[in-house]
C-alpha cells in the first residue's frame, strides 16, 4: 500500500488483511458513493482471520494469524489505523492469540471473542479500553467458538455460529455487560462457521459461512423481539470466511472462499427490496479479511 496521505473523506468501507496463498497486509478502502478503491498503508504484519472495528474514528485490526511460507503464527496483536495520517500504530496485545476471531464494540470498548491459538479453541472473551490501552478478561462464552460472527445490538453482544473444534455450530449466545454473563439464544436454522454477522434495522443478520460440508449462500436474520431466525434472499455467491459490514442501511459482504476460489466479489443487500446485487470487485480475491466502516 502507499504511504501517502489518505484523502479526508467519511464513510469508507475498509478491508484489512486476508488470505490468498498467504496472509496479506493490504489495507484498502471502498467508497460506495463513487465506486472507487483507495490503496492505503499496509498492515505492519500480514494477517488473515482478523477482525476489524472502528472506535472514535480509528480503525482497529484485531487478532488473526500470519500464515506465510516462513511459518504460521497466531496473533494477539491489536493495531490502530488513523485515517487522517494513513498510519498504523501498535496497541496493547490481547492476553492470548486469537485467529478467526470475532469483535464487537459497546460504549467505545472493543470485545474480542473466541478464536484459536494452535489447536486451542477459545471460549474466552476480553475487553479493550482504548483510553487506557488495556485488555481485561470478561466472562467466557458458554461455547468455544472460532470463525464466530459477532454483532452488537442494543448494547448487547451476540456471538453467532462458529466451530468448537469438533462441530460447526448453529448455536448463538448473548453477553450482558451489566451482568457479565452469557445466555444462549435461539439457534439459527443453519449451521454456520465463518459466516458474516452484522446488525441492520434491529435485526442480526448471518450471511453465508460453512456448514461442515459446503459453503453457503443463504442468509438469515434474528429478530430480537420475536426471538426467531428467518431466511431472507440468498447471496449470489456461496462464501465462507467473508467480510461484512453495514453502510447507509445496506449490508456489504466482501470476498471469502467458495470452496474453489478466493472471491473478489462484493455484494450489497437492500432490505427494502430483499435483493442482493454485485456492486464492485476487490482488487484481488481473498478470504479472512477484517472489515469496518469509518464513522461520520
Amino acid at each position: 500500500g502507499s504511504m501517502g496521505h489518505a484523502p479526508k473523506v467519511g464513510r469508507l468501507i475498509y478491508t484489512a488483511g486476508g488470505y490468498f496463498r498467504q496472509s496479506l497486509s493490504y489495507l484498502e478502502a471502498y467508497n460506495p458513493s463513487d465506486g472507487t478503491w483507495l490503496d492505503l498503508a499496509d498492515l505492519q504484519v500480514p494477517r488473515s482471520g482478523l477482525a476489524g472495528c472502528v472506535v472514535g474514528g480509528l480503525l482497529y485490526a484485531v487478532g488473526g494469524r500470519n500464515n506465510s511460507p516462513d511459518g504460521n503464527t497466531d496473533s494477539s496483536a491489536l493495531d490502530c489505523y488513523n485515517p487522517m495520517t494513513n498510519q498504523w500504530s501498535p496497541c496493547a496485545p490481547m492476553s492470548v492469540p486469537r485467529n478467526r476471531i470475532g469483535v464487537g464494540v459497546i460504549d467505545g470498548h472493543i470485545y474480542a471473542v473466541g478464536g484459536s491459538h494452535g489447536c486451542i479453541h477459545h471460549n474466552s472473551v476480553e475487553r479493550y479500553e482504548p483510553e487506557r490501552d488495556e485488555w481485561h478478561l470478561v466472562a467466557p462464552m458458554l461455547t468455544r467458538r472460532i470463525g464466530v460472527g459477532v454483532a452488537v445490538l442494543n448494547r448487547l453482544l451476540y456471538a453467532v455460529g462458529g466451530f468448537d473444534g469438533t462441530n460447526r455450530l448453529n448455536s448463538a449466545e448473548c453477553y450482558y455487560p451489566e451482568r457479565n454473563e452469557w445466555r444462549m439464544i435461539t439457534a439459527m436454522n443453519t449451521i454456520r462457521s465463518g459466516a458474516g454477522v452484522c446488525v441492520l434495522h434491529n435485526c442480526i443478520y448471518a450471511a453465508g459461512g460453512y456448514d461442515g460440508q459446503d459453503q453457503l449462500n443463504s442468509v438469515e436474520r434474528y429478530d430480537v423481539e420475536t426471538e426467531t431466525w428467518t431466511f431472507v434472499a440468498p447471496m449470489k455467491h456461496r462464501r465462507s470466511a467473508l467480510g461484512i459490514t453495514v453502510h447507509q442501511g445496506r449490508i456489504y459482504v466482501l470476498g471469502g472462499y467458495d470452496g474453489h476460489t478466493f472471491l473478489d466479489s462484493v455484494e450489497c443487500y437492500d432490505p427494502d427490496t430483499d435483493t442482493w446485487s454485485e456492486v464492485t470487485r476487490m482488487t484481488s480475491g481473498r478470504s479472512g479479511v477484517g472489515v469496518a466502516v469509518t464513522m461520520e
Epitope: N67, R100, C119, T166, Y210, A241, S287
Partner: antibody, heavy 120, light 107 residues
C-alpha cells in the same frame, strides 16, 4: 466407509515435478481438512501440508514451502500435492490423511501411500 | 518447532508383557498428543488421541496418559499383532510434529 487412495508417485530426477492425487470416497472432501504426511525410507513420519475447506487456507512444512502446493477439487472429490523443484531428500512414501470426527488434529484415516523417488 | 522425543527407540518384549513407551515434548502441548501404530509397508493407524482418548475400534489394552509434557502409551498385555512401530504426534502448535518412533520387537 471412508477411503483415501493416493496415486501419482514414481521416479523423478532432481529438480523435476510430480503431482500426487488423493481420491476420497465415503465422505466429501469438502467436509474435512486434508493433510499430506510423508515417510522417508526407514525413517519417521513428517507432516507436509494441509488445506482447510472452510477458509481455503493452506499450511506447509518449512522443508517444502514454496516448492509444494496442496489443492482440492471438490467436483472430483480429490486432493492434490503438486511437487516442484524436487530434491533427493523428498524421497518418501507420501500419505494423505484426514482427522476423525472429534476435536483433535490427529489423523484417523490414511491412504495406503504412494512412493516418490527423487534420483538421477 | 516443538520436538517430540520418544523413548526407547526400540524394545524387545514377550507376548503378555506390559509395555510402556514415552514421549517428551520440548514445550507445553496441553493434551494435544496422539499415538499411532505402524506395521511395515502399511499406513499408520490411530490408537490414542487427545493424550488419553481411545480411538474407536482400538483394543482396550492400549491406553495413554499425560504428566505435564511427558506422554505415555501403555500396552497392558502385549499380543502377537502388537509387534510394530509406534509414533507419538503433537498437534498443539504448527507444525504438527512426530516422535522418531519406537520399534516393538519379539524377545
Amino acid at each position: 466407509e471412508v477411503q483415501l487412495v493416493e496415486s501419482g508417485g514414481g521416479l523423478v530426477q532432481p529438480g523435476g515435478s510430480l503431482r500426487l492425487s488423493c481420491a476420497a470416497s465415503g465422505f466429501a472432501i469438502s467436509a474435512s481438512s486434508i493433510h499430506w504426511v510423508r515417510q522417508a525410507p526407514g525413517k519417521g513420519l513428517e507432516w507436509v501440508a494441509s488445506i482447510d475447506p472452510e477458509t481455503g487456507e493452506t499450511l506447509y512444512a518449512k522443508s517444502v514451502a514454496g516448492r509444494f502446493t496442496i489443492s482440492a477439487d471438490t467436483s472430483k472429490n480429490t486432493a492434490y500435492l503438486q511437487m516442484n523443484s524436487l530434491r533427493a531428500e523428498d524421497t518418501a512414501v507420501y500419505y494423505c490423511a484426514r482427522r476423525g470426527d472429534y476435536g483433535s488434529w490427529s489423523f484417523a484415516y490414511w491412504g495406503q501411500g504412494t512412493l516418490v523417488t527423487v534420483s538421477s | 518447532d516443538i520436538q517430540m522425543t520418544q523413548s526407547p527407540s526400540s524394545l524387545s518384549a514377550s507376548v503378555g508383557d506390559r509395555v510402556t513407551i514415552t514421549c517428551r515434548a520440548s514445550q507445553s502441548v496441553s493434551s494435544a498428543v496422539a499415538w499411532y501404530q505402524q506395521k511395515p509397508g502399511k499406513a499408520p493407524k490411530l490408537l490414542i488421541y487427545s493424550a488419553s482418548s481411545l480411538y474407536s475400534g482400538v483394543p482396550s489394552r492400549f491406553s495413554g496418559s499425560r504428566s505435564g509434557t511427558d506422554f505415555t502409551l501403555t500396552i497392558s498385555s502385549l499380543q502377537p499383532e502388537d509387534f510394530a512401530t509406534y509414533y507419538c504426534q503433537q498437534s498443539y502448535s504448527f507444525p504438527s510434529t512426530f516422535g522418531q518412533g519406537t520399534k516393538v520387537e519379539i524377545k
